[in-house]
Interface confidence: medium
Amino acid sequence: VPRWRQQWSGPGTTKRFPETVLARCVKYTEIHPEMRHVDCQSVWDAFKGAFISKHPCNITEEDYQPLMKLGTQTVPCNKILLWSRIKDLAHQFTQVQRDMFTLEDTLLGYLADDLTWCGEFNTSKINYQSCPDWRKDCSNNPVSVFWKTVSRRFAEAACDVVHVMLNGSRSKIFDKNSTFGSVEVHNLQPEKVQTLEAWVIHGGREDSRDLCQDPTIKELESIISKRNIQFSCKNIYRPDKFLQCVKNPEDSSCTSEI
């Protein structure tokens, strides 16, 4: 590594990042007929333009606007599933419940899911060595600003009943510092969103506590209520059974509480 290169605290750009983004875009547009006219080369060019040659601690939402425009997508506003710290289950759910959407079920979320990227100021290089860490280096890094931008837009688009899946195994079931807590909660539109329904996912098999009474859930309820949005909460005691019942709702064991 050249000595002059800035060393950041986070992992570097994901290997084969450009190829991955382009391939994901092509795959997405094939799977989703309504998006098949998206030009993936232009999407990649816009993605690249958001961070290449820019200082990776000085990225703005404005940098991503060309990409946002190309990735404009209409999802049913009443079928949105937000999540916090429980991505895998949320994605498993929308894979079964095909009419509901997480952010990663949209084109832009799908492109960037689990990837890391950053560039270097005044060079056209992608930095595969290291990228800024949100805590240790800076918050205005390419990855964080991307997710803040797409998450805000996703939340703004939501209407009627919005669902959020929360991880009941964490000390902070609702974390104000998560993307959900810091961005999405504050960008739900009260004139469009009637209710936020939280699904608290239990971790332990024998855990029968009512986690909807958790202090952090009460904090979420307070924030939401102050925004003139109703709040409801459900415990999902058995996530495995929950998924099974989504797949097979006619199953006789699915009438009891899950």
Epitope: E30, R36, H37, C40, K69, L70
Partner: antibody, heavy 120, light 111 residues
Framework: EVQLVESGGGLVQPGGSLRLSCAAS????????MHWVRQAPGKGLEWVAF????????YYADTVKGRFTISRDNAKSSLYLQMTSLRAEDTAVYYC?????????????WGQGTTVTVSS | DIVMTQSPDSLAVSLGERATINCRAS??????????MHWYQQKPGQPPKLLIY???NLESGIPDRFSGSGSRTDFTLTISSLQAEDVATYYC?????????FGGGTKVEIK
């Protein structure tokens, strides 16, 4: 070098069937959507059908819908067009064409074509 | 369906002179700020060959005397200095909406 080689054309009576094949080489076939495009004698080009890389999306021109079936075998790097209930107006040179990698709907490589004649 | 109308049907141009072919779409073929219009060259007895994609992008390996322009419904293919090997029929094609449709072709000959 990208190569697409069509086969299976020939003379068939109206109402008959034919199966066209396209053998692909020189590129990773499973990464690309593929099309069939035809050209009637002395006429222009007409798009017939498309199949995505993993066969998840298939589209047809209205003129062939319900009669033609596009399919592919990625393991064999082959594209197919099953044609049934053939009509005189299906007489044409049939080209298989590779979809441009980054955007649906245009063609960066074409085969030499195979001739289908529907006549009694 | 989007109807593509090419003009003229045929064109005779002297060697070294400019050839201009027009294509008009029956409706807008722009989307996401991109024109989904493409141009192909077909020589007798050969398959078509992609020249220009998305209105103005030159396909790799195509000489730069070929250029494309236009947006929305009106597009132009220009050969800046006609060469003998450019004698062919040229087709425009849109990919903004299914079905994919081609123009009727413009035959370019040497005067």
């Amino acid at each position: 070098e990208v190569q697409l080689v069509e086969s299976g054309g020939g003379l068939v009576q109206p109402g008959g069937s034919l199966r066209l094949s396209c053998a692909a080489s020189g590129f990773t076939f499973s990464d690309y959507g593929m099309h069939w495009v035809r050209q009637a004698p002395g006429k222009g080009l007409e798009w017939v059908a498309f199949i995505s890389s993993g066969s998840s999306s298939i589209y047809y021109a209205d003129t062939v819908k319900g009669r033609f079936t596009i399919s592919r075998d990625n393991a064999k790097s082959s594209l197919y067009l099953q044609m049934t209930s053939l009509r005189a107006e299906d007489t044409a040179v049939y080209y298989c064409a590779r979809n441009y990698v980054s955007s649906y709907g245009y063609f960066d490589y074409w085969g030499q074509g195979t001739t289908v004649t529907v006549s009694s | 369906d989007i109807v593509m109308t090419q003009s003229p049907d045929s064109l005779a141009v002297s060697l070294g002179e400019r050839a201009t072919i027009n294509c008009r779409a029956s409706e807008n073929v722009d989307n996401y700020g991109i024109s989904f219009m493409h141009w192909y060259q077909q020589k007798p007895g050969q398959p078509p060959k992609l020249l220009i994609y998305r209105a103005s992008n030159l396909e790799s390996g195509i000489p730069d005397r070929f250029s494309g322009s236009g947006s929305r419904t009106d597009f132009t293919l220009t050969i800046s200095s006609l060469q003998a090997e450019d004698v062919a029929t040229y087709y425009c094609q849109q990919s903004n909406k299914d079905p994919l449709t081609f123009g009727g072709g413009t035959k370019v000959e040497i005067k």
